[in-house]
C-alpha cells in the first residue's frame, strides 16, 4: 500500500501483542508498527489475526483474509487501552487454538507468529510462555519474537524458534519502525515463480521454484515441494537443493496434456503449507522438441 518491499506468500499470520501496563504510553508505536507491517503482506491467500495479551489473552481479530475485516481489526487495535500483567502464554494459547481449528478443518496452511513484548518474563511466566510457544510449534507454526526495551533476549530466543528468530529493539518503541524491513524479510516465505512453468506430459522434469525465505525453516531437511494436481491429489517431493531464494525440485510426472499442478511449499515435512498462485501446466511435446 505504501510502496517498498512486500510479501506475496500465502500463509496464516498471527500478531501476538503485549498490552500490559508497561506499554501504556507506547501503544501508538506498537499499533503503527503492526499497521505498517500488515499492509506489506499482500497475497489474497494470506490470512491474519490480531491477538493481545495482558492478564488475559484476547483474539481482537480472528483469522481472516478479508481486507475490510483486517482494516476494521486495525481500527480495533488502535483503540486498545493497555493495562495488566504480561501473560504472554495466554497470547500463544489463543494462536494455538486457531491453528488447531484450521488444521482440523483440513486447511493445513502454514502459520507464522510474530510476538511482541517489552519486559522480562518472571520465571513461571517464562515457563508457561515457552510451553505454549512449543505447542504452537507442534501445530506447525514458525515463531518470531520482537523484544522492546527491557526484554530478556535469552528468554525470547527460547520462546521463538531460535536466536535468529528474535528481533531486538534496544532503542525503545520509536525504533520499532526501523525493524519492519528486516522482519518482513525474515518472516516472509513466498513462492514467486516456477521454471519451467510448462512441462511435457508424461516426462520427468526438475523445477526451479523461485521465491524467498526457504531457509527460514527450523530444519531445512524438512522443506518439501508440494504439487496439488487438478485441485485434488497432492504430491510432496523432497528438493535436491534448498536455498533462500530458490528450491530445485523433482516435478511429478503428469501423464495427460492440460493437467495443472498448483505449487506449495512445506517448511515442516508436510505438516502445513505455504500456498501460491503459481501453476505448472502440461503440454504435448513431440519427439525431439
Amino acid at each position: 500500500e505504501d510502496g517498498g518491499p512486500a510479501c506475496y506468500g500465502g500463509f496464516d499470520l498471527y500478531f501476538i501483542l503485549d498490552k500490559s501496563g508497561s506499554v501504556l504510553h507506547h501503544w501508538n508505536e506498537i499499533y503503527y508498527f503492526v499497521e505498517q507491517l500488515a499492509h506489506k503482506f499482500i497475497s489474497p491467500q494470506l490470512r491474519m489475526s490480531f491477538i493481545v495479551f495482558s492478564t488475559r489473552g484476547t483474539t481482537l481479530m480472528k483469522l481472516t483474509e478479508d481486507r475490510e475485516q483486517i482494516r476494521q481489526g486495525l481500527e480495533e487495535l488502535q483503540k486498545v487501552l493497555p493495562g495488566g500483567d504480561t501473560y504472554m502464554h495466554e497470547g500463544f494459547e489463543r494462536a494455538s487454538e486457531q491453528i488447531y481449528y484450521e488444521n482440523r478443518q483440513g486447511y493445513r496452511t502454514a502459520s507464522v507468529i510474530i510476538a511482541l513484548t517489552d519486559g522480562e518474563l518472571h520465571e513461571d511466566l517464562f515457563f508457561y510462555s515457552e510451553r505454549e510457544a512449543n505447542r504452537s510449534r507442534d501445530l506447525g507454526a514458525i515463531v518470531y519474537c520482537v523484544g522492546v526495551k527491557d526484554f530478556n533476549e535469552t528468554q525470547l530466543a527460547r520462546i521463538a524458534d531460535s536466536k535468529d528468530h528474535v528481533f531486538p529493539v534496544n532503542d525503545g518503541f520509536q525504533a520499532l519502525q526501523g525493524i519492519i524491513h528486516s522482519i518482513l524479510k525474515k518472516s516472509c516465505i513466498e513462492i514467486l515463480a516456477a521454471e519451467p512453468s510448462t512441462i511435457c506430459a508424461g516426462e520427468s522434469f526438475q523445477v526451479v521454484v523461485r521465491g524467498n525465505g526457504f531457509r527460514h525453516a527450523r530444519n531445512v531437511d524438512r522443506v518439501l515441494c508440494s504439487f496439488k494436481i487438478n485441485d485434488s491429489v497432492t504430491l510432496n517431493e523432497k528438493p535436491f537443493s534448498v536455498e533462500d531464494t530458490y528450491l530445485l525440485c523433482p516435478a511429478p510426472i503428469l501423464k495427460e496434456v492440460g493437467m495443472k499442478a498448483a505449487l506449495q511449499v512445506s517448511m515442516n515435512d508436510g505438516l502445513s503449507f505455504i500456498s501460491s498462485s503459481v501453476i505448472i501446466t502440461t503440454t504435448h511435446c513431440s519427439d525431439g522438441s
Partner: antibody, heavy 117, light 106 residues
Framework: QVQLKESGPALVKPTQTLTLTCTFS??????????VSWIRQPPGKALEWLAH???????SYSTSLKTRLTISKDTSKNQVVLTMTNMDPVDTATYYC?????????WGQGTLVTVSS | DIELTQPPSVSVAPGQTARISCSGD??????VHWYQQKPGQAPVLVIY???KRPSGIPERFSGSNSGNTATLTISGTQAEDEADYYC?????????FGGGTKLTVL
C-alpha cells in the same frame, strides 16, 4: 472410527480414591495438538471439566479440584487414567472421557460413579 | 477463568427458529463451542470455533459470536432437537462450560 470407553468402579466409599480408565481407539495420543479430557456431570446438573492431558504429556487441571486430581497416559495401550482422591458423596456423577484439544469432538458413553458408605 | 452464562430454558414451536445465548465478558474475543445432550446420552459437538459445523451435523445448526454474547441458532427446529445445550470455551489452559440450556420443542 474414533471410540472412547470409560471403566472403573460404580461405587466408592467416602475418603477413598477413585481410579478411572479411558480406553480409546481410532486416534493416537502421539499426534500433535490433541489430547484427552475428563468431564463429569452430577445427576440433573451441568457438565464440569476436570482435567486434560496433551499429546506431548502436558497436563492441566480444574482449578477447584487440582489438589485431588492426577491424569496420566499410556500411549502404547491407548489409555488415559484419572485418579481422584478423598471422594465425597458430592462427587457422585457420570464421568466422561472425551477427545480434543480446545473443544471435545468425541465422547465416551460415560460411567456413573456413586459415592456412598 | 471466564464465566459462561446461559438461560436455564428456551421454548420453541416446531419449524420455528430457536436461539440459545451464552454470555461472558468480551466472549467475542475467544472461541465458543456448543454441545447437544439428550437424556441418558453423552454430549455431541454441534458447533465449534464459533460457527464451524462438524460433519454429520445438520445445516439447521449455526453459531455466531461477538461482543459479550455467543448464540447457537437452530432454524426450522424439529422435535428431535429437544435436548440440553451447553456452550464451552477454553481459557487459561482450562475448558469452561456454561450451565446448560434446556430446549423444549412445544
Amino acid at each position: 472410527q474414533v471410540q472412547l470407553k470409560e471403566s472403573g468402579p460404580a461405587l466408592v466409599k467416602p475418603t477413598q480414591t477413585l481410579t478411572l480408565t479411558c480406553t480409546f481407539s481410532g486416534f493416537s495420543l502421539s499426534t500433535s495438538g490433541g489430547g484427552v479430557s475428563w468431564i463429569r456431570q452430577p445427576p440433573g446438573k451441568a457438565l464440569e471439566w476436570l482435567a486434560h492431558i496433551y499429546s506431548n504429556d502436558d497436563k492441566s487441571y480444574s482449578t477447584s479440584l487440582k489438589t485431588r486430581l492426577t491424569i496420566s497416559k499410556d500411549t502404547s495401550k491407548n489409555q488415559v487414567v484419572l485418579t481422584m482422591t478423598n471422594m465425597d458423596p458430592v462427587d457422585t456423577a457420570t464421568y466422561y472421557c472425551a477427545r480434543g484439544g480446545y473443544f471435545l469432538d468425541y465422547w465416551g458413553q460415560g460411567t456413573l460413579v456413586t459415592v456412598s458408605s | 477463568d471466564i464465566e459462561l452464562t446461559q438461560p436455564p430454558s428456551v421454548s420453541v414451536a416446531p419449524g420455528q427458529t430457536a436461539r440459545i445465548s451464552c454470555s461472558g465478558d468480551n466472549i467475542g474475543g475467544i472461541y465458543v463451542h456448543w454441545y447437544q445432550q439428550k437424556p441418558g446420552q453423552a454430549p455431541v459437538l454441534v458447533i465449534y470455533a464459533d460457527s464451524k459445523r462438524p460433519s454429520g451435523i445438520p445445516e439447521r445448526f449455526s453459531g455466531s459470536n461477538s461482543g459479550n454474547t455467543a448464540t447457537l441458532t437452530i432454524s426450522g427446529t424439529q422435535a428431535e432437537d429437544e435436548a440440553d445445550y451447553y456452550c464451552q470455551s477454553y481459557d487459561i489452559t482450562s475448558l469452561v462450560f456454561g450451565g446448560g440450556t434446556k430446549l423444549t420443542v412445544l
